[in-house]
Amino acid sequence: FEIALPRESNITVLIKLGTPTLLAKPCYIVISKRHITMLSIKSGERIVFTFSCQSPENHFVIEIQKNIDCMSGPCPFGEVQLQPSTSLLPTLNRTFIWDVKAHKSIGLELQFSIPRLRQIGPGESCPDGVTHSISGRIDATVVRIGTFCSNGTVSRIKMQEGVKMALHLPWFHPRNVSGFSIANRSSIKRLCIIESVFEGEGSATLMSANYPEGFPEDELMTWQFVVPAHLRASVSFLNFNLSNCERKEERVEYYIPGSTTNPEVFKLEDKQPGNMAGNFNLSLQGCDQDAQSPGILRLQFQVLVQHPQNESNKIYVVDLSNERAMSLTIEPRPVKQSRKFVPGCFVCLESRTCSSNLTLTSGSKHKISFLCDDLTRLWMNVEKTISCTDHRYCQRKSYSLQVPSDILHLPVELHDFSWKLLVPKDRLSLVLVPAQKLQQHTHEKPCNTSFSYLVASAIPSQDLYFGSFCPGGSIKQIQVKQNISVTLRTFAPSFQQEASRQGLTVSFIPYFKEEGVFTVTPDTKSKVYLRTPNWDRGLPSLTSVSWNISVPRDQVACLTFFKERSGVVCQTGRAFMIIQEQRTRAEEIFSLDEDVLPKPSFHHHSFWVNISNCSPTSGKQLDLLFSVTLTPRTVDLT
């Protein structure tokens, strides 16, 4: 190989060992039989050399640095050449470095031809191995603006006082042009300006200077986004840290065309603007840091540009001003991550503050809109607390557990609406009365409606799930001893059409000791399946539940248990079941931890089934499933 550098070219070539490899055979640069591992060639020198091995690219890298002095004379502006040409260099991983020094008052602009640049974060690499590392200067301090790959949105970077641009090319890469030009500009009065151009939908991730280290103290950095007017942009902060400020406040400022409040100032912890039409600027302003404990300011953010959806121009009013103790969250439904670009899906408050989740609270009227290609990617979860603190005031009081129509009119599917029903301990209990009788969901007879009610204890220490219930069954009411949560969960978009079938009334009633009582009025047409609460986990220790089963005068009920033995093994106490005729009070008692379960039995009058648990040994829980079937009486037994 021969490298000859013209005099006055201000170019230095350095060949040195790259990252050490585990290759056993070393490799040397050989110059007239001398072996070296580092070779420096300066302007005006001509050197002939070889390598002592077959694959020097596995060992060595080459750096070509050109110093451009704009202090003492005119600057060589325009397209930057690769000098010496890549064809004259050994095939090593090579880095071309341009170090431009200029006065503080001079602005320097790097212009990148297509493909534009895409910034990468620490630990990331470029698919083709071509990287652009750009740094600036504040007095004598070097500031890293960022590392970039090809195929992005960054078209121009403006700096002042100097710029260092390093273009890294892998040894096998055929590129023979720098891909950028340098222009002079007036002073930009800040650290740098990065211009990011979107031609269509897409996203860009960008970082503050020196990221992930700290942004220089009291500096200003601006990103200019060029977005076609027909598209919408949203900003989200992926990662940020705040330093300890002594004076001034760290902030981001937006210049948004058409805004009457330019610049719009946000704290880094605020929700950032979304649904912006056309071009906008974002600036990061540092502060004077505490000398003793400065901390670090850093920011990594994403700009997402996409087509406005039909929904994005519609404003929805969610009036929660008459509600109390209620919160509504619109959030992404869980989904497998896709590797290809997925347009963002945002919900916007007042059309400007957009984020992937939004929580609205009671007491106010909220205006929301959506910036989302597919609203099925979102769902709603609502929580409302109905509590009674004074038992004298609440007793016999009723509340309708109904999803408000404002919520049903939103274009987003309701997932859960949870009512937390709280009563004073040992003073009151609750009764749930559905508008339509309920069916308990079982494997034998699953619910196939578009929604269900999930009823569970709301006492933190108690793990008690009564079950899942849907309209169209035989359960007329459910009484529960203490605090519960009732969750209306939807399973299909058709819930909107079936919403009229929902309706549950809760009333506060005098306290009773049993954990739950189910009132069942079977229909003649079908078999009713019932199961103990906490199915699969077992009825909690020392818990008692009852079923009040009505039998019409002209019918006979067949009670059938679905296994021979309960399977429970008691550690302490006894588990038992009482089947009691309501008219005669005649009762049968079964020891569930000893006896076999009763064979199918026939009941001509309404009856009770009461199941009470012991403290079972782990793994030997109490789970019972039974059915009630009505058939017409054939003989009058009265």
């Epitope: 350095l14 055979k25 040397y28 039989k33 001398r34 072996h35 070296i36 580092m38 070779l39």
Partner: antibody, heavy 116, light 111 residues
Framework: EVQLQESGGGLVQPGGSLKLSCAAS????????MSWVRQTPEKRLEWVAY????????YYPDTVKGRFTISRDNAKNTLYLQMSSLKSEDTAMYYC?????????WGQGTLVTVSS | NIVLTQSPASLAVSLGQRATISCRAS??????????MHWYQQKPGQPPKLLIF???NLESGVPARFSGSGSRTDFTLTIDPVEADDAATYYC?????????FGGGTNLEII
């Protein structure tokens, strides 16, 4: 482990010839440049010859040029030094050395005495 | 020919102290960003052993007590602290120009 073992030294009359051998093991011999270095009875070290890894390039100081020839057989992992027209000032301990970024590995040496 | 002059010719240093050996070249041994100067240690009955290559680089397996410095014509080998095992003759060698040459050696004695 890198090992270099010289042989072929001995007593020779002035004007005589001698061929030294250096058997190499523990490394890929064909990848390395080799040299001969000698140490006089006064303990002065002198570089004598250089050969590139493929054997295509050889270099000598003026003191031995035309009289000494360095060669190698990469198939046999052996380095040679053919010495002729020997002089009394060639009396020395002859070392073969592997040249990396300096003479990184040396053999134990073979003694050549030129005397009548 | 480049002549290498080592000084002192012999040196006695107490255990644990610093030993400094100098090597002066009759002309510069620097080129292409490198100083082509190497240092060797030789004990009686043994071949020389490479300690420092290209003026300041420690050969692998050599204790960090050994260090090299210098450029152009003036070079130094420093041993700090000296250990009993360091008693030997030390040579400098240049290969910037043909013929490659060695210094006359410095004999280090530990007292």
């Amino acid at each position: 482990e890198v090992q270099l073992q010289e042989s072929g030294g001995g007593l020779v009359q002035p004007g005589g010839s001698l061929k030294l051998s250096c058997a190499a093991s523990g490394f890929t011999f064909s990848s390395y440049t080799m040299s001969w270095v000698r140490q006089t009875p006064e303990k002065r070290l002198e570089w004598v010859a250089y050969i590139s890894n493929g054997g295509g390039s050889t270099y000598y100081p003026d003191t031995v040029k035309g009289r000494f020839t360095i060669s190698r057989d990469n198939a046999k992992n052996t380095l040679y030094l053919q010495m002729s027209s020997l002089k009394s000032e060639d009396t020395a301990m002859y070392y073969c050395a592997r040249y990396d970024l300096g003479f990184a590995y040396w053999g134990q040496g073979t003694l050549v005495t030129v005397s009548s | 020919n480049i002549v290498l002059t080592q000084s002192p010719a012999s040196l006695a240093v107490s255990l644990g102290q610093r030993a400094t050996i100098s090597c002066r070249a009759s002309e510069s041994v620097d080129s292409y960003g490198n100083s082509f100067m190497h240092w060797y240690q030789q004990k009686p009955g043994q071949p020389p052993k490479l300690l420092i290559f290209l003026a300041s680089n420690l050969e692998s397996g050599v204790p960090a007590r050994f260090s090299g410095s210098g450029s152009r014509t003036d070079f130094t080998l420093t041993i700090d602290p000296v250990e009993a095992d360091d008693a030997a003759t030390y040579y400098c060698q240049q290969n910037n120009e043909d013929p490659w040459t060695f210094g006359g050696g410095t004999n280090l004695e530990i007292i």
